[in-house]
Amino acid sequence: EVEKTACPSGKKAREIDESLIFYKKWELEACVDAALLATQMDRVNAIPFTYEQLDVLKHKLDELYPQGYPESVIQHLGYLFLKMSPEDIRKWNVTSLETLKALLEVNKGHEMSPQVATLIDRFVKGRGQLDKDTLDTLTAFYPGYLCSLSPEELSSVPPSSIWAVRPQDLDTCDPRQLDVLYPKARLAFQNMNGSEYFVKIQSFLGGAPTEDLKALSQQNVSMDLATFMKLRTDAVLPLTVAEVQKLLGPHVEGLKAEERHRPVRDWILRQRQDDLDTLGLGLQGGIPNGYLVLDLSMQEALS
């Protein structure tokens, strides 16, 4: 807190300019009018204030707007945004995507801070849903943003927004998140033809059910092993050897290298060894010939 002192003669700030970098904290407090600061916030970012000086400017704005800053000020906060606490940001009502972009730009290249997380939360809640433009903006700044949301939060993402998602945006998503996103992606891309559809849906397939994988196997998609390894184990297990062969196409040879890893390992254990042998890859661990396989899950369903 800066002590209250009168502004020295001749030092009253008539505008926000670089001469203020020479002011002490107490002089900024005494000589810079908060209303002037608010109307000329766009200049602050161009002036090389120290963090100590920015503390004083923030304090002046806090006094002027105890209920939270108006968006006209928020949009021009620039580096002063880094001085804001999540508590400060919770008082804001940010509705403009331009304001959001301006503040994200300040934090660019850094991890998502608690301030940024709070800002995004306030913005998305204010909009009611994660629309395409917002998602586009957020994933541009934070590729991992989508995967930081809970399945419940992801449920508010409209299918139309899925068009903004890039494969790298899903890199850190877990199966629960992909379970939510996959049906939205399927809906979003439903009018595309086979090969184009597969390119778009590929990164979401970690949430795909067995029946959709079976359908894809009929379309000569040639899924790569990296995508196959990310599929849900429970969705892969019911696939036949023939279906997997069709699904992977020329990439089927890669199964040998992955035979000890899920979901390949578990899938091999469910296949007849005879069928595995038809692949000519030397996959071992299938069900020996003459053994009867009971599908207990089907039995439970019938009972």
Epitope: P8, E18, S19, I21, K24, T50
Partner: antibody
Framework: QVQLQESGPGLVKPSETLSLTCTVS??????????WGWIRQPPGKCLEWIGN???????NYNPSLKSRVTISVDTSKNQFSLKLSSVTAADTAVYYC?????????????WGQGTMVTVSS | DIVMTQSPSSLSASVGDRVTITCRAS??????LAWYQQKPGKVPKLLIY???TLQSGVPSRFSGSGSGTDFTLTISSLQPEDFATYYC?????????FGCGTKVEIK
């Protein structure tokens, strides 16, 4: 480490302009962490602050000298300069350039060795 | 302008003595005060800033105190290399101003 070196004529005629340059070595004048200043000390008298400059060119002068002083910076040469116009014998002094860390309670932490300037015809 | 007044203007002391120099500001300057040491023909050297913060590399026998208008520089045990002139300077507001010095001489 950072060193400062003043240079310029040791003798200036009354009513002329005193010009001095301070060369910064061992560090960049373009650091956002410092102001660069000029201070003088007339023989047997007190130290007097002349003014400060930031690498961007923004400057701040002692009001008692403001009408006669110009401090400028040349980042490409890592130098800053002092010009004092209309000099009189009262401007005879040792002139120091110094570094001033940017902080609320700042102080001149590195000084040049000083250069004696005599104003005489 | 803020006027800085040092006292005494000179003093004589012996090696090992405790020496105290005072500086008074014409108005309150909080703790915006620095102390410098200058030996004959040499450059001023920063000892203390913010009234009591020791500059890096300065021996711990030097200490500063005070706030507002009255400040003190203390040398707890005077060493031969400490014989010099000491200046205070306020950085509370521009124009920065210096005291006219206290000369510490050998008794």
């Amino acid at each position: 480490q950072v060193q400062l070196q003043e240079s310029g004529p040791g003798l200036v005629k009354p009513s002329e302009t005193l010009s001095l340059t301070c060369t910064v070595s061992g560090g960049s004048i373009s650091s956002s962490s410092y102001f660069w200043g000029w201070i003088r000390q007339p023989p047997g008298k007190c130290l007097e602050w002349i003014g400060n400059i930031y690498y961007s060119g923004s400057s701040n002068y002692n009001p008692s000298l403001k009408s006669r002083v110009t401090i400028s910076v040349d980042t490409s040469k890592n130098q800053f300069s002092l010009k004092l116009s209309s000099v009189t014998a009262a401007d005879t002094a040792v002139y120091y350039c110094a570094r001033l860390p940017r902080g609320d309670r700042d102080a001149f932490d590195i000084w040049g060795q000083g250069t004696m300037v005599t104003v005489s015809s | 302008d803020i006027v800085m007044t040092q006292s005494p203007s000179s003093l004589s002391a012996s090696v090992g003595d405790r020496v105290t120099i005072t500086c008074r500001a014409s108005q309150g300057i909080s703790n915006y005060l620095a102390w410098y040491q200058q030996k004959p023909g040499k450059v001023p050297k920063l000892l203390i800033y913010a009234a009591s913060t020791l500059q890096s590399g300065v021996p711990s026998r030097f200490s500063g105190s005070g706030s507002g208008t009255d400040f003190t520089l203390t040398i707890s045990s005077l060493q031969p290399e400490d014989f010099a002139t000491y200046y205070c300077q306020q950085s509370y507001s521009t124009p920065f101003t210096f005291g006219c010095g206290t000369k510490v001489e050998i008794k």
